[in-house]
Amino acid sequence: DGNSTRSPETNGLLCGDPDENCAATTTQSKRKGHFSRCPKQYKHYCIKGRCRFVVTEQTPSCVCDEGYIGARCERVDLFY
């Protein structure tokens, strides 16, 4: 519910079309979820990453840029 995932390909699909729903497996949860684009009200939600919306839970989730971690990709990954 707001957990971050890293961006390498192992994370599965990201949404291409702004309005499309897609399935993805996050590295943290290891379960399938359906994602859509985030509402524009969340345009600044993810500090260093991309926002996607967990449709079933109606919550934003961040896919962090490489080298960043945290629910909002707000922390540098010291182990990267």
């Epitope: 684009r37 009200q41 109606q58 919550t59």
Partner: antibody, heavy 121, light 107 residues
């Protein structure tokens, strides 16, 4: 069961300010976004602004920017809406409404009973 | 701002009728749309969230559909307590905006 209880009706003079309160019970007050929506007599619903949890601050509709202030006191589970420089067109029922999300402003699943503010000289 | 336009602005119907109300957004809002019912002197009540999800406690005769810019609220069999005004609301972007409302009256 979540309940939002608003302060009573107000009659104000043009140019003055009004502050309406909204006390929440039965839920985790600080986790949810509280918005203010107004409805002029015989008119539709108009969102004025709201506190956005992930931002930790209020966001306002441009129309009310600089004239409205939305605040919350977590210690008393009460949200406030203050509207200044009142004019006759501000005569309306003012509702507080809770967002269904603990992140942003989504659907308004709980509403206060409304507070009628009448602006008249 | 995202403009929300409802049609019709009012309609007359009888108990048992199937009623359809449409809402159009001025730009694509994906499925970030809610529907409310309001009766005179009362606060609005959430019926449908995220375009098609029925809010808990709302009768199944209410349903919502649509995505992008065009959305529909359907009442499959109108009941006496359904005579009210209905509003759509987008939550894609600030400011949150509502449609102007559709009043459902008794024929």
């Amino acid at each position: 069961q979540v309940q939002l209880v608003q302060s009573g009706a107000e009659v104000k003079k043009p140019g003055s300010s009004v502050k309406v309160s909204c006390k929440a019970s039965g839920g985790t007050f600080s986790s949810y976004a509280i918005s203010w929506v107004r409805q002029a007599p015989g008119q539709g619903l108009e969102w004025m602004g709201g506190i956005v949890p992930w931002m930790g601050e209020a966001v306002y509709a441009q129309k009310f920017q600089g004239r409205v202030t939305i605040t919350a006191d977590e210690s008393t589970s009460t949200a406030y809406m203050e509207l200044s420089s009142l004019r006759s067109e501000d005569t309306a029922v003012y509702y507080c409404a809770r967002s269904s999300s603990t992140y942003g402003i989504h659907a308004f699943d709980y509403w206060g009973q409304g507070t009628l503010v009448t602006v008249s000289s | 701002d995202i403009q929300m336009t409802q049609s019709p602005s009012s309609l007359s119907a009888s108990v048992g009728d199937r009623v359809t109300i449409t809402c159009r957004a001025s730009q694509s809002i994906s499925n970030f749309l809610n529907w409310y019912q309001q009766k005179p002197g009362k606060a609005p009540k959430l019926l449908i969230y995220a375009a098609s999800n029925l809010q808990s406690g709302v009768p199944s005769r209410f349903s919502g559909s649509g995505s992008g810019t065009d959305f529909t609220l359907t009442i499959s069999s109108l009941q006496p307590e359904d005579f009210a005004t209905y509003y759509c609301q987008q939550y894609d972007d600030f400011p949150m905006t509502f449609g102007q409302g559709t009043k459902v009256e008794i024929k």
